[in-house]
Interface confidence: medium
């Protein structure tokens, strides 16, 4: 999916008032330095394709994020503030679940709740400069 | 609703195999991982083993190799489990559970297994 | 593997107590824990997931809490219901281990 059309101020603001609550109740209990941030993102669209990739594609060492409070929420936001996302993920959530194939390993969800919180302060970051 | 309803209780004989069902419903059986937690009399529980059905990959703990079989039948979703060359230390409580992401969030009732001559 | 050691084995409380009980992990597992809770003759119950997330229709009263190698289950209102005996489980790398168990009695 192409993010460029996507209402990026929405976003962040849906972002900053419940997503990154739910992101942080995750991470709770787990120091920030525990994991260190190797995802990154250079601009606001591969920010949230960097973002829905780690959110909704399950990892071999994570499969259950996309189930979680905060997964739902992005998945609500980026269908109400980037036309026909939602369109789009119906083929893509398909494609996923055919090719999908995880194995028994060291659990990775932390870390990658860790990197997910990385990127979207790389978004919002991003989003400053711009304005 | 998600539930695993295990087969009935078991009596064997020293030597002997036993196959254990855990029959899936009210969620896509190929979604998730199915493990195998033994629970000894009185005693705590110990993990078997786990099957992804969706490629019967399988992996299991060290001390249960050669001792334990994990397979699946998608197409009734079931999970089995069979215990080879049982001996009387195999007596127990066998539960299969299922997880995403290693804990487990719904149990079958459990099956006894009692190994006796 | 990591060994998982739970303390008390065993405690004895009155309905309405706080309740504590403590799983230590032999390495770092930083908050991948679960506690479970079984009665006799039923399967275990999920409680609480990464350490601190409560399962789903899980009584407010079980809270878990810490990270690292030192966790704490705890039930701030004993209730009749909740006699029973708690497992802890790391899901950090296979093998799952569990503690031994606590078994939680009427005074």
């Known amino acids: 999916y192409d993010f460029t059309n996507c209402d990026f101020q929405k976003i962040e603001a849906d972002y900053l008032r419940t997503i990154s609550k739910d992101l942080i109740t995750y991470m709770s209990g787990t120091k920030s330095t525990d994991f260190n941030n190797t995802v990154s993102c250079s601009n606001r669209p591969h920010c949230l394709t960097e973002i829905q990739s780690l959110t909704f594609n399950p990892t071999p060492r994570c499969a259950s994020l996309a189930k979680e409070m905060f997964a739902r929420k992005t998945k609500a936001t980026l269908a109400l503030w980037c036309p026909g996302y939602s369109e789009t993920q119906i083929n893509a959530t398909q494609a996923m679940k055919k090719r999908r194939k995880r194995k028994v390993t060291t659990n990775k969800c932390l870390e990658q709740v860790s990197q997910l919180l990385g990127l979207w302060r790389r978004f919002i970051r991003t989003l400053l400069k711009k304005q | 609703q998600v539930q695993l309803v295990q087969s009935g209780a078991e009596v064997k004989k020293p030597g002997a195999s036993v196959k254990v069902s855990c029959k899936a419903s009210?969620?896509?059986?190929?979604?998730?991982?199915m493990h195998w937690v033994k629970q000894a009399p009185g005693q705590g529980l110990e993990w078997i083993g786990v099957?992804?059905?969706?490629?019967?990959?399988?992996t299991y703990n060290q001390k249960f190799k050669g001792k334990a079989t994990l397979t699946v039948d998608t197409s009734t979703s079931t999970a089995y489990m069979e215990l080879s060359s049982l001996r009387s230390e195999d007596t127990a409580v066998y539960y299969c559970?299922?997880?995403?992401?290693?804990?487990?969030?719904?149990w079958g009732q459990g099956t006894l297994v009692t190994v006796s001559s | 593997d990591i060994q998982m050691t739970q303390s008390p084995s065993s405690l004895s409380a009155s309905v309405g107590d706080r309740v504590t009980i403590t799983c230590r992990a032999s390495?770092?597992?930083?908050?991948?824990l679960a506690w479970y809770q079984q009665k006799p003759g039923k399967s275990p119950k999920l409680l609480v997931y990464?350490?601190?997330r409560p399962a789903a229709g899980v009584p407010s009263r079980f809270s878990g809490s810490g990270s690292g190698t030192d966790f704490t289950l705890t039930i701030s209102s004993l209730q009749p219901e909740d006699f029973a005996t708690y497992y802890c489980?790391?899901?950090?790398?296979?093998?799952?281990?569990f503690g031994q168990g606590t078994k939680v009695e009427i005074k």
């Open positions: 559970t299922r997880s995403l992401d290693g804990f487990f969030d719904y």
């Open positions: 009210g969620y896509t059986f190929t979604s998730y991982w």
């Open positions: 099957i992804d059905p969706s490629d019967t990959y399988t």
């Open positions: 390495e770092n597992i930083y908050s991948y």
């Open positions: 990464f350490a601190r």
């Open positions: 489980q790391h899901h950090y790398d296979t093998p799952w281990t």
